[in-house]
């Protein structure tokens, strides 16, 4: 099948570099590098850098990229984030903060702006900044279902920690449902795990964005790091290629 | 790097077949096919076929083989199974069958016979035959810990079903602990998931091996299909090669 | 995906999974494996053209990357993507053994 | 495993992951990717000898299977095993975009 020759390491590197040139453009579905004529001067906006850093950092509970990947996952995914609706919103009044649960609500019109069609969503992660924790805590994540019912999604055993740490839950399926449904506001509940015979069901873990009594600058910083959904999706204009070029090679 | 020639499909097939010859022997760490001189005549024993079929069948909750595999996983794993201690054993008297839980105990001397050293264990699955289920049920698996405490392991959402179905839980870490500890009897608890505010915590799912009032042949069939641990481990004699050839090429 | 569904029903010339059934007796001359009698091992075959050079027309080439060189290798190669294990039954002396062999069955291929 | 830990600190001649840092400006002449400035792409290189023929001495060969031809390929090939994604920031017009590119960084290789 093949006849081996002496390997020219420099040639291999050059071929790999050229292949990467094609790979990046191809993943972005660009025929050539984008024009830089309209790029505003100065550094990148803070929010963009924050989003880039969120994407770059692997966080607790997030699995490494699975292999093999479906064909559509070859292409680049645009990353956006949607912050949780702030806790002074009236939606929270319906759900009394209990000792065993906290609630997180999201505006579906913001989700739809980021991901207009359910099929475009590639991954959705709920990210929470947990503050330091003195004891081990077993927590569960629920999705708001119909009326006042909640559907169990997943759980996590949180080890004690002296420093804040980002947690990530894969909520792709849930967000895809929300995008299909078109409700106005949807939510999650984080609860202490309650065993059938245990009596102490207090949620010990402190999640950034819920601690009361903060004022001024601290509240702002706190608010920026409140729970959010990190979304990875095929951009609409790129997806239209797939809609129109659906046939197999 | 290579010069392509016309592909000779038959040559490729022959090379693949010969490579498989080496692969199988190599995975079994055999220098040549084993002698068949002492093989008893007649068909394979029932128990062996049952074990073979258990291994061959993918069951609910069992993931496909992960890639990449650690180096040691290249080699073949011997498959054995250890049945749950029968429910008339006195160990069960200490744990009153409640409406929300069932208990499953295993004899660690049987586990040790199958896997003499914890490091040899590659995978352990707890397999349960669930009988038909009318409503969706969320169940949790716990490991018996110290004294009377239980440690949460995993959970499963069971969909309604008209027919019996095998369930599988990955309990590799737990069984490895048991093999390290040298207790006499160890156990699991399968419980209904109890949410902090829910009141109905009954375990609706019927697991084969616990239903009362069976007699004669039916009880035997029932007993054969009672919960068991499916163990995959490197045989001791094969592992000794690994012990002595640990150094990198 | 270049899997058995697609490849076995097409005449794909490029990288694809190819059908190969191994009969232990006929193909390997082995009588010592009691179960199964054989298995669908399959294999990967077909070119993965290196599709980049500065004088190549960008747009034509870029559309082919996904299939022919998704990993941007200097020398892409047709290799297994999804693999499955194979349990076997054989005897050691008088004792029957059930063993599982990892990564024995090729279900799909990829250019890598 | 043939990963960066092992391969970058050894003089392995056979299949291994090799170091390659791509600087977008220097290597590709690109100024349009604003973050990162470059990344460790790496690549796989090195022979995976086909190690089976009926006249080969069984025992010597069998020990080498694990490394050189674990998938029992007719023509084993050195390819990526573990890959990682790369997020980038670039502009489309005046709008900054963060996108994640899958399988861009080679962490380890295997003969397949």
């Amino acid at each position: 099948l093949s006849t081996c020759k002496t390997i020219d390491m420099e040639l291999v590197k050059r071929k790999r570099i050229e292949a990467i040139r094609g790979q990046i453009l191809s993943k972005l579905r660009l025929a050539s590098p984008p024009s830089q004529g309209e790029v505003p001067p100065g550094p990148l906006p803070e929010a963009v850098l924050a989003l880039y850093n969120s994407t770059r950092d692997r966080v607790a509970g997030e699995s490494a990229e699975p292999e093999p990947e479906p064909e559509a996952d070859y292409y680049a995914k645009e990353v956006t984030r949607v912050l949780m609706v702030e806790t002074h919103n009236e939606i929270y009044d319906k759900f009394k903060q209990s000792t065993h649960s906290i609630y997180m609500f999201f505006n579906t019109s913001e989700l739809r702006e980021a991901v207009p069609e359910p099929v475009l969503l590639s991954r959705a992660e709920l990210r929470l900044l947990r503050l330091k924790l003195k004891v081990e805590q077993h927590v569960e994540l629920y999705q708001k279902y119909s009326n006042n019912s909640w559907r169990y999604l997943s759980n996590r055993l949180l080890a004690p920690s002296d420093s804040p740490e980002w947690l990530s839950f894969d909520v792709t399926g849930v967000v895809r449902q929300w995008l299909s449904r078109g409700g106005e506001i949807e939510g999650f509940r984080l609860s202490a795990h309650c065993s059938c015979d245990s009596r102490d069901n207090t949620l010990q873990v402190d999640i950034n964005g819920f601690t009361t009594g903060r004022r001024g600058d601290l509240a702002t910083i706190h608010g920026m790091n409140r729970p959010f959904l990190l979304l990875m999706a095929t951009p609409l204009e790129r997806a239209q290629h797939l809609q129109s070029s659906r046939h197999r090679r | 790097l290579s010069t392509c020639k016309t592909i000779d499909m038959e040559l490729v097939k022959r090379k693949r077949i010969e490579a498989i010859r080496g692969q199988i022997l190599s995975k079994l760490r055999l220098a040549s096919p084993p002698s068949q001189g002492e093989v008893p005549p007649g068909p394979l024993p029932e128990a062996v076929l049952a074990l073979y079929n258990s291994t061959r069948d993918r069951v609910a909750g069992e993931s496909a083989e992960p890639e990449p595999e650690p180096e040691a996983d290249y080699y073949a794993k011997e498959v054995t199974r250890v049945l749950m201690v029968e429910t008339h054993n006195e160990i069960y008297d200490k744990f009153k069958q409640s409406t929300h839980s069932i208990y499953m105990f295993f004899n660690t001397s049987e586990l040790r016979e199958a896997v003499p050293e914890p490091v040899l264990l590659s995978r352990a699955e707890l397999r349960l035959l669930r009988l038909k289920l009318k409503v969706e049920q969320h169940v949790e698996l716990y490991q018996k810990y110290s004294n009377n405490s239980w440690r949460y392991l995993s959970n499963r959402l069971l969909a309604p079903s008209d027919s019996p179905e095998w369930l599988s839980f990955d309990v590799t870490g737990v069984v490895r602990q048991w093999l390290s500890r040298g207790g006499e009897i160890e156990g699991f608890r399968l419980s209904a998931h109890c949410s902090c505010d829910s009141r109905d915590n009954t375990l609706q799912v019927d697991i084969n091996g616990f239903t009362t009032g069976r007699r004669g042949d039916l009880a035997t069939i029932h007993g054969m299909n009672r919960p068991f641990l499916l163990l995959m481990a490197t045989p001791l004699e094969r592992a000794q090669h690994l012990q002595s050839s640990r150094h990198r090429r | 995906a270049l899997d058995t569904n697609y490849c076995f029903s097409s005449t794909e010339k490029n990288c694809c999974v190819r059908q190969l059934y191994i009969d232990f007796r006929k193909d390997l001359g082995w009588k010592w494996i009691h179960e199964p009698k054989g298995y669908h091992a399959n294999f990967c075959l077909g070119p993965c053209p290196y599709i980049w050079s500065l004088d190549t027309q960008y747009s034509k080439v870029l559309a082919l990357y996904n299939q022919h060189n998704p990993g941007a290798s200097a020398a892409p190669c047709c290799v297994p993507q999804a693999l499955e294990p194979l349990p076997i039954v054989y005897y050691v002396g008088r004792k029957p053994k059930v063993e599982q062999l990892s990564n024995m069955i090729v279900r799909s291929c990829k250019c890598s | 495993a043939l990963d960066t830990n092992y391969c970058f600190s050894s003089t392995e001649k056979n299949c291994c992951v090799r170091q390659l840092y791509i600087d977008f400006r220097k290597d590709l002449g690109w100024k349009w990717i604003h973050e990162p400035k470059g990344y460790h792409a790496n690549f796989c290189l090195g022979p995976c000898p086909y190690i089976w023929s009926l006249d080969t001495q069984y025992s010597k060969v069998l020990a080498l299977y694990n490394q050189h031809n674990p998938g029992a390929s007719a023509a084993p090939c050195c390819v990526p095993q573990a890959l990682e994604p790369l997020p980038i920031v670039y502009y489309v017009g005046r709008k900054p975009k963060v996108e994640q590119l899958s399988n861009m960084i080679v962490r380890s290789c295997k003969c397949s």
Partner: antibody
Framework: EVKLQESGPGLVAPSQSLSITCTVS????????VSWVRQPPGKGLEWLGI???????IYQSGLISRLSISKDDSKSQVFLKLSSLQTDDTATYYC?????????WGQGTSVTVSS | DIVLTQSPSSLAVSAGEKVTMNCKSS????????????LAWYQQKPGQSPKLLIY???TRESGVPDRFTGSGSGTDFTLTISSVQAEDLAVYYC????????FGGGTKLEIK
């Protein structure tokens, strides 16, 4: 070429369950969704449910307790199961490839619920 | 649930004439942030399965003749056939995907 083919039992007795298989070719079930739609004789179309590429399912609210959709990606098959059938479940059942919209449909399989 | 009402329920026109049919939604189908309406039109010829004509209220599916045009926004939508052909004999359904998926009752087009 994209193709979808439904196969079902034709006749089902009341109170029994209906199982239909949709076998697809020309696209991957890991990338696209598949919707199920039915059409009673001489009437309009009714969406029943969808299974997305990642396995997420969504059902019409009126059928949640009776409907189940699953799939086998490796066999390129999608399965519909509808339990406790009544005579008004008599219809032609279609599966459709779902991207932004239902862009390719199978020919449909006719199901009659009758004793 | 969103209800779609189609009018007229049937109409008969001669070949070559222009025809319009309407679809009214019980709530807005417009995603104002991306300026797209979640409405599609399907054609079902006698004895056949439905076929996609238009999505996002006005985007024509590839391969659909340009005599078919979709328009409207919010709650009121129209399908226009500029010059009816004999092969356009069919029932036309609108479908919303703003909140799950529901179809209108259909408009039956007959050719005089």
């Amino acid at each position: 070429e994209v193709k979808l083919q439904e196969s079902g039992p034709g006749l089902v007795a009341p109170s029994q369950s209906l199982s239909i298989t949709c076998t697809v070719s020309g696209f991957s079930l890991t990338t696209y969704g598949v919707s199920w739609v039915r059409q009673p004789p001489g009437k309009g179309l009714e969406w029943l449910g969808i299974i997305w590429g990642d396995g997420t399912t969504i059902y019409q609210s009126g059928l949640i307790s009776r409907l189940s959709i699953s799939k086998d990606d490796s066999k390129s098959q999608v399965f519909l199961k509808l339990s406790s059938l009544q005579t008004d479940d008599t219809a032609t059942y279609y599966c459709a490839k779902h991207y932004f919209v239902m862009d390719y449909w199978g020919q449909g399989t006719s199901v009659t619920v009758s004793s | 649930d969103i209800v779609l009402t189609q009018s007229p329920s049937s109409l008969a026109v001669s070949a070559g004439e222009k025809v319009t049919m309407n679809c009214k939604s019980s709530q807005s189908l417009l995603n104002s942030r991306i300026r797209k309406n979640y409405l599609a039109w399907y054609q079902q010829k006698p004895g056949q399965s439905p076929k996609l004509l238009i999505y996002w209220a006005s985007t024509r599916e590839s391969g659909v003749p340009d005599r078919f045009t979709g328009s409207g926004s919010g709650t009121d939508f129209t399908l226009t056939i500029s010059s009816v052909q004999a092969e356009d004999l069919a029932v036309y359904y609108c479908k919303q995907s703003y909140n799950l998926w529901t179809f209108g009752g259909g408009t039956k087009l007959e050719i005089k």
